[in-house]
């Protein structure tokens, strides 16, 4: 606000004012009168920028004169009283109240004086993030969708995202006159390394005290990526029992496990329990190649790893005693 | 037209009181401010206090102060300037002028015809 | 209280320029001051030209114009008429109250 003039009288009023969509607000304007100076203020006007007429008087004889009486309000002016306050209350914000205002204040023997006040009408936005479940495409799409609904002025949407990628941002007209519904995509390509993984949707507002931030955690949909486990290149015969794992990544989660050597079924020494085949001790050598079938919704993936079980003589660090 | 008639000549004796009248026509009454402004024999024009006719707030100069009383009557639309333990340097001519507006700035706009105050003993 | 000075005499010929000062003993003339100017003709009631400076009051010619200069204030009188031969007198506000000046008789010949 300005600072008081010195021998002169000056109004006071912050040079904008924000209020929100459908509630009240009120537009501060006050006459500082230096200590020494006699004034006599006869009327309080306001009005608004392009309009002709005044939409609020106040008469030091007469009292208030509205042009929408339901709406308008002097807020301390009173008859009988010194008029150095003249703000005015506003009901119902509609966003065609958004402009500029000039209060003014007829002093005597001063002359008019008078400040202009910008009203900003805001509506504050609900927002929301959700993921896009998506499968594995191999081009560019949508993972996270952030909706600001119904803000005015639009928010501002960005993404924080260690994934790559980029945002896709578009605005449409809110529910409310005047709002605006802004939606953001953050658009990359699918892989399975992405699933699982979150993306931070911010989202800005002069409303906001701070930016609100939605974390969306992703979803990528993508078949079994399946690796065996378990055999270190060090198998020797006459040793303790093994194990080998499937090692399988996929969203849905497996819904089966299948072991297989490449010559077909298993051999009696290998005994298949889910997700990991036990190799029983074997008294000959041997040089299998065995197969892991992982099932999801999606389809089956498998791996193969093939095992030899060596001639030589057994130690405490070497044989079959992987697990 | 606007206009301000002013009452008759009065001659007084020291110590005594005057009250001058002022009949405004042809404006709002009610929303207009009044000055007084007096002019003694071969000296300068002198301004009392103005009035605002509407809720009768005032300001006096601090020389008058305690002396002066400044009322209005709105039903008759008249200004009243009353002076009080006349002295013979309140001798002099009162006037009484309305002040106009501009829409920017305020000026002394249409004056009285004047009042002859004599004090003599 | 301050004293306000003006010239006590001016002479201007007939469509010429005159300018008349008025200067207050507490200092500069400033817009705070809301300096007035009033015109007298013999005979005739007081007339009001000039308020808050330098608006023209409605109905007077536009010849007469109210201004500040350097440290004082003044009327100016473009292209004088006749008629326009008075006395002038310069009113200022001072934060309560209002001080005139002594008046400039101006003289059109």
């Known amino acids: 606000w300005p600072p008081p003039g010195t021998g002169d009288i000056v109004v006071q009023a912050p040079t904008q004012v924000p209020g929100f969509l459908g509630d009240s607000v009120t537009l501060p304007c006050y006459l500082q009168v230096p200590g020494m100076e006699e004034t006599h203020v006869s009327q309080l006007t306001w009005s608004r920028h392009g309009e002709s007429g005044s939409m609020a008087v106040f008469h030091q004889t007469q009292g208030p004169n509205y042009s929408e009486p339901k709406r308008l309000e002097f807020v301390a002016a009173r008859l009988g009283t010194e008029l150095r306050d003249a703000s005015l209350r506003m009901f119902g914000l509609r966003v065609e109240d958004e402009g500029n205002y000039t209060c003014l204040f007829v002093a005597f023997p001063q002359g008019s004086r008078s400040v202009d006040i910008w009203l900003r009408v805001l509506a504050k936005p609900q927002n929301t993030a959700e993921v896009q479940k998506v499968q594995l495409t191999g081009k560019p799409v949508p993972v996270a969708r952030c909706v600001s609904t119904g803000g005015r002025p639009p928010a501002h949407i960005t993404w924080h995202s260690d994934l790559g990628g980029m945002p896709n941002t578009s605005q449409a007209p809110g529910f409310l006159s005047g709002t605006v519904t802004v939606t953001s995509l953050w658009i990359l390509v699918p892989s399975s390394q992405v699933d699982g993984k979150s993306v931070t949707c911010k989202v800005e507002h002069e409303s906001f005290e701070k930016p609100q931030l939605l974390t969306v955690n992703l979803t990528v949909y993508y078949p079994p990526e399946v690796s065996i486990s378990g055999y270190d290149n060090n198998w020797y015969l006459s040793q303790n029992e093994a194990t080998l794992t499937c090692d399988a990544r996929s969203n849905p989660e497996p819904t089966g496990y299948n072991w297989s050597t490449t010559m077909g079924p298993l051999p009696p020494f290998a005994v298949a329990q889910g997700a990991q085949l036990l190799i029983r001790p074997v008294d000959k050598p041997i040089n299998t190649t065995f197969i892991c079938n992982v099932t999801n919704a999606l389809g089956a993936r498998q791996a193969e790893l093939t095992v030899q079980v060596k001639e030589g003589p057994p130690s405490e660090h070497s044989g079959m005693s992987s697990n | 037209q606007v206009q301000l008639v002013q009452s008759g000549a009065e001659v007084k004796k020291p110590g005594a009181s005057v009250k001058v009248s002022c009949k405004a026509s042809?404006?709002?009454?009610?929303?207009?401010?009044i000055s007084w402004v007096r002019q003694a024999p071969g000296q300068g024009l002198e301004w009392i206090a103005w009035?605002?006719?509407?809720?009768?707030?005032?300001n006096y100069n601090q020389k008058f102060t305690g002396r002066v009383t400044m009322t209005t009557d709105t039903s008759t639309s008249t200004a009243y300037m009353e002076l009080r333990s006349l002295r013979s340097d309140d001798t002099a001519v009162y006037y009484c002028a309305r002040h106009g507006y501009t829409g920017r700035g305020w000026y002394f706009a249409v004056w009285g015809q004047g009042t002859t105050v004599t004090v003599s003993s | 209280q301050a004293v306000v000075t003006q010239e006590p005499s001016l002479t201007v010929s007939p469509g010429g320029t005159v300018t008349l000062t008025c200067r207050s003993s507490?200092?500069?003339?400033?817009?705070?001051?809301?300096a007035n100017w009033v015109q007298q003709k013999p005979g005739q009631a007081f007339r009001g030209l000039i308020g808050?400076?330098?608006n023209r009051a409605p109905g007077v010619p536009a010849r007469f114009s109210g201004s500040l200069l350097g440290d004082k204030a003044a009327l100016t009188l473009s292209g004088a008429q006749p008629e326009d031969e008075a006395e002038y007198y310069c009113?200022?506000?001072?934060?309560?109250?209002?001080?005139f000046g002594g008046g400039t008789k101006l003289t059109v010949l």
């Open positions: 009035i605002y006719a509407g809720t009768g707030d005032t």
């Open positions: 507490t200092g500069a003339v400033t817009t705070s001051n809301y």
């Open positions: 808050g400076t330098n």
């Open positions: 042809g404006y709002t009454f009610t929303s207009s401010y």
């Open positions: 009113i200022l506000w001072y934060s309560n109250h209002f001080v």
